[in-house]
Each structure stands twice: as C-alpha cells, then as structure tokens.
C-alpha cells in the first residue's frame, strides 16, 4: 500500500534507522554532489524506509566478492509513494539505494512521468562509503511547487548496463480551482434560451460551481464542474459570473455582459463628399449595431424642392464601407439625403436629414441648323449655328466649343475653337486648301459641354475657284451633307 | 492558526443601525466566504446567508431579506453584518464562521467568539 | 425550510459512559451528488460552535475517535462511545443539502 504524507503531518527524519552495514545516522556524507546547472533532474522522494528491498526493477550482480559470496540484488529503497501539498509549498523527496563498492561510476537521474528531468533542478545526491557498500541518497527539492509539478517521479540507475528503477512517488499539488473554461460573452435575442458554461479543476476534485448574475446567485446549491447554465432568456443585459469551490476555498471566474441584440442606432454624421451634376458621394458614421452585425444600408432621397410629387427615392447597399455613390439624379436639384442601416432585428432610425445639391448639367442638345461656307476673299470659313433649347438644370450656357477638322490627301488635323455665348457665328481661317473641313459645334455650360451637332462638311478648293453655296446641317436621314466646290 | 475576531457587545435602541464587523487572520481572506449565524436567547441557530469574500456577492435566507446587509473590507480582511431599522426581535448572538463549498459540502469551519447585540428601548 | 428535530433536549450521562443523540429531517438530506450533507457542532458553555463531523460520518481533524455518526436519508445519530468531562456542551446538527441550512435545537450533554 502506498503511505501518503500531507502536509500537515509531522516531518520525518532523512533516515528512520540506520542503513544496513553499520551506517549510522549521525555519519555525515564523505561526499556529496549537489547538481547545479546542467545533469541531474529535479526531484526527490521523501524519507527514506529501510524495510523490505524493492521487488520491482532489480539487479542481480555477477561479481562475486574474495569469499566468492554473491552479492544481494540491487534495488531502491522504499519511500513515500504519495505526497499532497498545498501550493506555493515547499517539498523535499529522497530514494536511496546500496551499492557494493565494486561498482564505479553509479549515477541517479530523476525521471517525471516518463521523461528525464534535466536542467538547474534542486537535485542533491549524497554519497555514504562504508567498508562494503555505499548508501546513495539523492534528494529533490521544489521550493515553492505549481500546479505544473503534479505527477510521478521515479529515480533511475544504471548498473552493468542493467537499469535499476525506484517506485514512483506521486506528487499532488493541491490548491484553489483553476478555471479552465470560463463564460463568455455573448450578444442574445430577446427572450430566446443560451447556455453558458463554466469549467474548474483541483486538485483537490470535486470542484463546485456556484452561478452568479448581476451579483445575485443563480443556484443556492452548486453544481458539480462542469456546469453549463440555461438562461431561459433576458429582457435587458446582465453581467454572469461562476464561483468555482474546492477544499481549498473559492475562486472567482470574470464576469461576462450578455447583451440583448436591439435595432441599431440611426447613422451620425451624414454627408456630402463629393457632388456632380448628376450624382452625390455621402459618407456616414454607423451608429451602435445594437449587438448584432449591420447588414445593409438603405439610402433615403427626396427633392427638396417644394413644387416636386414628394416621393422618395431609395438606394439600397452594403453596410460597408459607409459610402455610397447616389446616381441618375437631376442636375442643379437640391435633395434631401437621409440614412438608415438593418442588422437581424431589424431597421434603424432614419439619421437627420441633410441638404445636398447636385451642380449645373452639361447641356443635353447640340446646337440647332449648323451651317458651313467658305468666304474666299477673306479666306475664312463661317459657321452658323441657332441656339439650343437649353433645361434650367443644364445651367448657364456660357459658350461653345467648334471641332474643326481638316482632311487631305496624307494630312488629317482637328482644331479646336472656344467662342463666347453672345451671338451664333463663328468665323475660323482656312487651314488647308484642297481640303475638306467637317465641322461640328457644341454648347458649353459650367457642368460641362454638351454633346456636338452631327457633322457639316465643305470641301476647300484651291486658290481662285468659285464661293459657292454653304454647307449646312441636314435634315434628318440626309446623307452627309459635303459641298464640292 | 485562522482566527475570527469579532466586535464587541452592543446595546441599542428600536429604529437604530448596527454594523457587526469580523476581522479574519492567518488565511487568504479572498479565498473564502463567511457566514452568518444568529443565537436568539433560548432558541436554536439559524443561518441568515453568507458572502464571497472575494467578489462580494452575498446570499440571503428569506428570513434575512431586506433590513440585513453583508460587506467586506477585503484590505481590512474584514466582513461586516448591518442591520438597519433594529426591533427587539433582533437581539441575539451574531456569529460569523468562515465558509465555502468543500468536498464535505458547507464548510463552516472556524466561527468567531460571537457579538451580543441587545435592542432595548 | 428543511427542520431538523434533535432528541432528547437534554442529556445527563456519567463520565466513561456511552451517549446518543437522533436528528431527524423533515426531508432526505440525501443529495443529487450521492453525499448527505448532515453535519454536527458542538458549543461548548461560553464558546462558539466548532465543527465535530460531517458528511453524516466523517470526523473534523482533532476530533477524538470516540465520536461516530450514522445513519441516511432522514434519520441520523451522534454516539459518544465513552463520555468525558470535556464533551459537555450543546451538540447540533445542521443539514446543507437544500437551501436554506437549518440546524436542530440542540441537545444539552450534561455530566451527572
């Protein structure tokens, strides 16, 4: 049976008796060794117990002394088999073994649940010479021992290549729970049923588990670890918490917001990042997802302007990345811009309103009835144009722009010509003879120019031909209208 | 050794408040909680709830709901039973004893000397 | 609440002889966990209780092996095989099986 030594029992002598062969107590060590940096493993099993010899892993020895008597097995004396201790505690354990001074070289390794202990462990082995044998004593020490040091430590031996082996002593480090699972936090329905689950260990087991919320205890009674508790649901957010108890006392887990999932927020900080004629960039600051990821936004518009129907444009997106580009709106239109994001429980508020205008449009017609003709005294060309019905939204016309390009053989050039809004002609030098010019004019507004009228050839002779009739724009389904002079 | 030490007699009138203290040593004080008992003359111990040391969240038997309060001054490594609104009801043996959940169940282990509380017009 | 009933309330014994006193439930103290929560305290004149025994049967450290506990479900016993002088004092058992603990009214051990 194994003894097991608690802490709180009486220490026990390094030796209860002398060893066998007249090694006596009060005998101090010839030599002793202690392990510091690099070799010996680090623990060491307690009071040694010259009773029985070990019956496990032992050496028979094939020397034989000058009176050719044989030599007793070798084997580790017994010891504790089990100490528990509290932690942060110290402990010291010792195996202790007799060699007949025949043999050299001995050496003790402490082993811990099947693997050497190597490094700068407190690991002592002491040396007793007597006429016949050595009484070997190494000793391990822990200082102040952690849950890490839980586990069974052997000592080994090797003797003409035969390994001799101790009993294990099983160290059991005891101290308050540790949790290993604690509760979580988590963003719920409304009334819906969740779990949480709380998980301690010893030793000392068993560990029971007491549930906390909002500083009230959920069970009277603990539960054994694990224990998992069933919210049957929550109107508003609570804080849970899990006591963990042992023989050692009480730990406490942190304590955890559960949160109801709730419609979000409506957006903050609505606007306006970019404008065109048509089209406006907003930005917008999420408002709090009420515990539940946002899924999409919808963008809310409506034209400001008092004489319109009232109805509302809307623009559906993702939640990210808080922008959107609003298209296929009217040039020069001021609307009202509002925003409002869904998560799973639903939509939020509308964000406050903002004002936005889009800018002034290009214009949406060419100019009307472009006529071409060629002033040969002055060598010019004229172009004549009428007006183009221009929309308030399209802006102010402030000018056109006339495309003029020239064609002959080998040579193709396209000028461009910028005039002021007053009057409808225009007058431009002739830039090749024996060319065509195909003309075309477009209206210009601040929003940009407008699309060009369809194209008028005239053909350029060489010097000294006749000025013959202009060239102009054509009825629809005409073919291109080209003047050979 | 743990120890209990509580605070001494105490004579009051109906209406008033007293505060009971237990001042603990020779254990980590957190890693408990403490009980409360009362010892009515001539009648038996009844446990009025106790309260984790470390997280001060304290349990009440219904009896001790409302006018009774449990606190800690865990740097003083102290625990305390108010009682507001004193009626001759209350005059009795306060005990605390240091408690927690063991393999054994309630622990109950270590019990202060007791504070004789005497409400008396 | 679970009501424990000690008997008898008072006990006089003489000195070396045995003694017993019986707790009984209103409920079993049997728990969910297989253990029974049924606990004994002694106070002694003047003093505070100190623990003498739980889990129906096992002793507090330091306490003498001439106090053992039997008994299961609803009906539990203290037996002193051979009183001595300082056994005096009032012995109760108290359960914590269900919430809230209760203890009994106590038994006076009194030396004849």
């Known amino acids: 049976a194994i003894t097991e030594a608690r802490e709180e029992a009486k220490p026990y002598p390094l030796f209860p008796g002398p060893f066998p062969g007249s090694l006596q107590t009060d005998h101090t060590p010839l030599l002793s060794l202690p392990h510091a940096s690099g070799y010996q493993p680090a623990l060491m099993f307690s009071p040694t117990q010259p009773g029985r010899p070990h019956t496990g892993n032992v050496a028979i020895p094939q020397v034989t002394s000058v009176e050719s008597k044989p030599l007793p097995p070798l084997a580790f004396k017994h010891t504790v088999g089990h100490i528990i201790l509290s932690e942060h505690k110290g402990v010291k354990f010792n195996c202790s073994i007799s060699v007949p001074n025949i043999y050299q070289d001995t050496t003790i390794s402490w082993w811990k649940d099947g693997k050497e202990l190597l490094g700068a462990h407190h690991a002592i082995t002491q040396f007793y010479p007597d006429d016949e044998v050595t009484a070997i004593i190494a000793s391990f020490s822990i200082t102040s021992v952690q849950r890490s040091d839980n586990g069974s430590y052997i000592c080994k031996m090797k003797i003409n290549n035969e390994e001799i082996v101790s009993d294990p002593i099983y160290i059991e480090v005891q101290g308050l729970p540790h949790f290993t699972k604690q509760p979580e936090s988590m963003n719920v329905t409304r009334n819906t049923a969740f779990n949480l689950t709380c998980q301690a260990v010893g030793p000392p087991e068993p560990v029971n588990i007491f549930w906390v919320q909002n500083s009230s205890r959920v069970n009277e009674q603990p539960e054994k670890s694990p224990s998992v508790l069933t919210v049957p649901g929550l109107t508003e957010m609570a804080v849970f918490s899990c006591e963990a108890h042992n023989d050692k006392g009480l730990t406490v887990s942190k304590g955890v917001q559960i949160n109801i999932k709730a419609i979000p927020s409506p957006p903050t900080e609505v606007s306006i990042r970019n404008s065109t004629a048509h089209s406006i960039l907003i930005s917008w600051v999420p408002g709090f997802d009420g515990y539940s990821p946002f899924r999409n936004c919808s963008i809310q518009v409506k034209e400001a302007d008092p004489l319109s129907n009232g109805s509302v444009m809307i623009f559906n997106t993702s939640a990210l990345p808080h922008l959107y580009q609003i298209k296929q709106l009217q040039a020069l239109a001021n609307y009202s811009i509002g925003v409002s994001c869904m998560n799973e429980i639903g939509w939020s508020a509308v964000s406050p309103w903002i004002l936005a205008s889009t800018t002034e449009g290009a214009p949406s017609v060419a100019p009307l009835n472009v006529t071409v003709f060629l002033n040969e005294s002055s060598d010019n060309v004229d172009i004549r144009w009428m007006k183009p019905p221009t929309k308030q939204q399209d802006g102010e016309l402030v000018g056109y722009r006339i495309s003029h390009v020239w064609q002959s053989a080998g040579i193709s050039k396209e000028l461009l010509e910028e005039v002021g809004q007053n009057g409808s002609r225009a007058r431009i030098s002739v830039q090749v003879h024996n060319a065509t010019c195909t003309v075309r004019i477009a209206a210009v507004t601040r929003g940009g120019v407008g699309p060009f009228s369809d194209p008028v050839k005239i053909f350029i002779p060489a010097h000294g031909w006749v000025d013959y009739a202009p060239s102009s724009t054509p009825a629809p389904g005409n073919a291109d209208p080209v003047l050979i002079i | 050794q743990i120890q209990l030490v509580q605070s001494g007699p105490e004579l009051k009138k109906p209406g008033e408040t007293v505060k009971i203290s237990c001042k603990a040593s020779?254990?980590?004080?957190?890693?408990?909680?403490m009980s409360w008992v009362k010892q009515a003359p001539g009648k038996n111990l009844k446990w009025m709830g106790w309260i984790n040391n470390y997280s001060g969240v304290s349990t009440y038997a219904d009896d001790f709901k409302g006018r009774f309060a449990f606190s800690l001054e865990t740097s003083a490594t102290t625990a305390y039973l108010q009682i507001n609104n004193l009626t001759n009801e209350d005059s009795a043996t306060y005990f605390c004893?240091?408690?927690?959940?063991?393999?054994?169940?309630?622990?109950?282990?270590?019990w202060g000397q007791g504070t004789t509380l005497t409400v008396s017009s | 609440d679970v009501v424990m009933t000690q008997t008898p309330l008072t006990l006089s014994v003489t000195i070396g002889q045995p003694a017993s006193i019986s707790c009984k439930s209103s409920?079993?103290?049997?728990?969910?966990?297989?253990?029974?929560?049924l606990n004994w305290l002694l106070q002694r004149p003047g003093q505070s209780p100190k623990r003498l025994m739980y889990?129906?049967?096992k002793l507090d450290s330091g306490v003498p092996d001439r106090f053992t506990g039997s008994g299961s479900g609803t009906d539990f016993t203290l037996k002193i095989s051979r009183v001595e002088a300082e056994d005096l004092g009032v012995y109760y058992c108290?359960?914590?099986?269900?919430?809230?603990?209760?203890f009994g009214g106590g038994t006076k051990l009194e030396i004849k």
């Open positions: 889990l129906v049967s």
């Open positions: 020779g254990n980590t004080f957190t890693t408990y909680g």
């Open positions: 004893a240091r408690d927690y959940y063991g393999s054994g169940g309630w622990v109950f282990d270590y």
């Open positions: 409920q079993s103290l049997l728990d969910s966990d297989g253990k029974t929560y």
């Open positions: 108290w359960q914590g099986t269900h919430f809230p603990r209760t």
